[in-house]
């Protein structure tokens, strides 16, 4: 009877397995109804082809335990070859095979595109035993199919170390159009043309595109995907989207805002972080960029002084970081500071102006007429000088710094003394005899230490020598003075 069944393979009207319409019964419901289910034809063995290189789907005939007859080759029966269904529908399909009862421990596994389907898939295998054979039906169901379920599904059965493989069932999931390219938000120049692109795919194809601007359709006739919309230019912000239509329905892209580029808003919150005598470190918060990246910023500085000529200093800087150190400023001066930034369209207005001051500077000149005497009886050195002519910006004089260096036979020692601002003379103890003492004096204000005077040298003899003549600051251009006693 089985042999006859094999010969009956001819009634398969066209080609078994992959032929989409090859089943002997109408199974329109399998493909066209919302809930599809696999159709299983009557139990029948697959025809084998003469001269086939290997068995693959067919298990080799085997002798029964009695040794009396050969068993037929085993093969999966043919089922539907191609299922087309809509996304989110349910589908069920199956494989079936009749296995002689002498075979034990048959297992059926499902594979998709070469990978075994394990775990969270709904596969059920049912066994229908008879006197000689057991009909096995392996069902595979997917609820709410997605595009990722597209693929070629096959059954594999392990039996006596043989692997029997079914013909494939191609599952093709169709659905609403799926966007592969959606319009992107853009910032455009006023009245300048620009393009937007929208692309969507099925299946099913074709996919038609309608463009929507501010909730109104732009094109009366649909365009085939992909579609490029050329907008001749805008004078104000607009929102665009595209609708993709296919036989399954419509998908709407995200809405994208098209902004018109403008000059930036002025920076805000200009603040002072640090002031020195000649520099001010400022920061600011950038204003709105006008839908165009900032290119650079300009720091504007005006001296607030009735006597100044009111000129504005301009310092250009990069737009980021939002910080700038203004240099080359006068000490102890008041300034008004504003910031403006630019993009490709132009400059912003200037930020609100803020007032800032530099601190006192250090004196810019050294004390004058420095003279040095050796007072041998007291064993000290008298130093005298004249107060320097400091500018107002240097601030109030708070004192003087005296540097005296003692050099003798390869030894050098520098000492510093601080004296008050009311003094114009000082005495220092002799540190070393038979040595040279080099003296320099600098004026000191709150702003810092000014330059030191030119060095004045005096020789300190061994005990018993007398020094009557002073050593003094030389006239400009003279070599270091040395008074030899």
């Amino acid at each position: 009877a089985i042999t006859e069944a094999r010969e009956e393979a001819k009634p398969y009207p066209l080609f078994p397995g992959p032929l989409p319409g090859s089943l002997q019964t109408d199974h329109t419901s399998l493909l066209s109804l919302p809930h599809t289910s696999g159709y299983q034809p009557a139990l029948m063995f697959s025809p084998t082809q003469p001269g086939r290189p290997y068995t693959g789907n067919v298990a080799i005939p085997r002798v029964t335990s009695a040794g009396s007859k050969l068993l037929p080759p085993l093969a999966f029966k043919h089922t539907v070859g191609h299922i087309i269904l809509s996304e989110h529908k349910d589908v069920k399909f199956n494989c079936s095979i009749s296995v002689p009862n002498i075979y034990q421990d048959t297992t059926i596994s499902w594979w998709k595109d070469g990978k075994e389907l394990l775990g969270a898939h709904h596969a059920i295998t049912q066994f229908y035993p008879d006197d000689e054979v057991t009909a096995i039906i392996a069902s595979f169901s997917i609820t709410s199919v997605q595009r990722s379920d597209n693929g070629s599904y096959i059954c594999k059965m392990k039996i006596n170390n043989e692997e029997i493989v079914s013909d494939p069932i191609y599952i093709e999931v169709q659905g609403l159009p799926h966007f592969t390219k959606q319009p992107e938000s853009m910032n455009v120049t006023r009245n300048t043309a620009f393009n937007l692109t929208c692309q969507a795919v099925g299946p099913p194809e074709p996919v038609n595109i309608f463009w929507v601007q501010n909730s109104s359709r732009v094109n009366e006739q649909p365009e085939k995907s992909p579609s490029v919309l050329t907008v001749p230019g805008l004078t104000e912000m607009a929102v665009f989207s595209c609708e993709a239509h296919n036989d399954k329905g419509l998908t709407v892209s995200k809405g994208v805002q098209i902004n018109i580029k403008a000059i930036p808003s002025p920076p805000t919150e200009v603040s002072i972080h640090n002031s020195t005598a000649h520099s001010i470190l400022i920061s600011w918060v950038p204003g709105f960029d006008g839908y165009s990246p900032f290119r650079n910023c300009s720091v504007q500085v005006k001296e607030v002084d009735p006597l100044s000529n009111g000129s504005v200093m301009i310092f250009n800087t990069s737009a980021s970081p939002h910080m700038y150190q203004i240099k080359q400023l006068q000490a102890l001066a008041n300034y008004s500071i504003g910031v403006s930034c630019m993009n490709e369209i132009g400059w912003s207005a200037v930020s609100p102006w803020i007032l800032a001051s530099t601190t006192e500077g250090a004196p810019s000149v050294a004390p004058l007429n420095v003279t040095v005497f050796l007072n041998e009886s007291r064993d000290n050195v008298d130093i005298r000088w004249m107060k320097p002519l400091t500018k107002r910006q240097a601030g109030e004089l708070v004192g003087y710094r005296i540097s005296h260096v003692w050099q003798s036979a390869g030894i050098s020692k520098e000492l510093l003394e601080e004296v008050g601002q009311n003094n114009s003379r000082a005495q220092i103890s002799v540190q070393v005899h038979n040595a040279t003492c080099t003296v320099r004096i600098a004026a000191v204000t709150k702003g810092g230490v000014g330059p030191f005077s030119d060095p004045v040298k005096i020789f300190i003899p061994a005990h018993g020598w007398v020094d009557h003549a002073p050593s003094s600051t030389p006239a400009p251009g003279n070599a270091d003075p040395v008074l030899i006693i």
């Epitope: 066209l14 493909l31 290997y54 068995t55 789907n57 067919v58 070859g81 693929g151 494939p168």
Partner: antibody
Framework: QDQLQQSGPELVKPGASVKISCKAS????????IHWVKQRPGQGLEWVGW????????KYNERFKGKATLTADTSSSTAYMQLSSLTSEDSAVYYC???????????WGQGTSVTVSS | DAVMTQTPLSLPVSLGDQASISCRSS???????????LHWYLQKPGQSPQLLIY???NRFSGVLDRFSGSGSGTDFTLKISRVEAEDLGVYFC?????????FGSGTKLEIK
């Protein structure tokens, strides 16, 4: 990228046999049918048959039974077509093609030219 | 066998013109599940056939929207809305509803 790469041109004598190959890449070879198509110079296309590499099942156009034998080697993802008892009528370009999910021959090999000449 | 009759055999067109190719089957290509397995291919000189339209009207990936297919049952049409130089070659229809699969005889699209 799914691809089918066919073997080079063949010049064979009448009465001989030839075996041409089609190597698949970029997809699961054992999951999709491979079809073979014949094209004689300046003529149309003629379907030879298919093989399903997953199990070796084949189907032939009646006109090519006994002429063509389709096989597949899954370890190398290669399908073969052997043509026997060649005559000048068998001189043609032979293509392999995959039957894709959409149930169309979606990817084709570049073709193998077979020339039968003494 | 399902005999596929394709017309015209040769189609001279000017660039930018619309071209229309017909394919008629000797039997209906709609199968019992309601699908029609009629596909269109273009074979450029010296190249393999390439799929343009599958199942009557679906454009294959990467195929430009100038190509469209229509029809049902036994009569099918391929249209090219604005012919470009790269469209020249031989166009074939193929049915895979019935075994053996059968091709149309081909239409050669050429410049006038």
């Amino acid at each position: 990228q799914d691809q089918l790469q066919q073997s080079g041109p063949e010049l064979v004598k009448p009465g001989a046999s030839v075996k041409i190959s089609c190597k698949a890449s970029g997809y699961s070879f054992t999951s999709y049918y491979i079809h073979w198509v014949k094209q004689r110079p300046g003529q149309g296309l003629e379907w030879v048959g298919w093989i399903f590499p997953g199990n070796g099942n084949t189907k032939y156009n009646e006109r090519f039974k006994g002429k063509a034998t389709l096989t597949a080697d899954t370890s190398s993802s290669t399908a073969y077509m052997q043509l026997s008892s060649l005559t000048s009528e068998d001189s043609a370009v032979y293509y392999c093609a995959r039957l894709g999910l959409i149930y169309a021959l979606d990817y084709w090999g570049q073709g193998t030219s077979v020339t039968v000449s003494s | 066998d399902a005999v596929m009759t394709q017309t015209p055999l040769s189609l001279p067109v000017s660039l930018g013109d619309q071209a229309s190719i017909s394919c008629r089957s000797s039997q209906s290509l709609e199968n019992s599940n309601g699908n029609t397995y009629l596909h269109w291919y273009l074979q450029k000189p010296g190249q393999s056939p390439q799929l343009l339209i599958y199942r009557v009207s679906n454009r294959f990936s990467g195929v430009l929207d100038r190509f469209s297919g229509s029809g049902s049952g036994t009569d099918f049409t391929l249209k090219i809305s604005r012919v470009e130089a790269e469209d020249l070659g031989v166009y074939f229809c193929l049915q895979v509803t019935h075994v053996p699969f059968t091709f149309g005889s081909g239409t050669k699209l050429e410049i006038k």
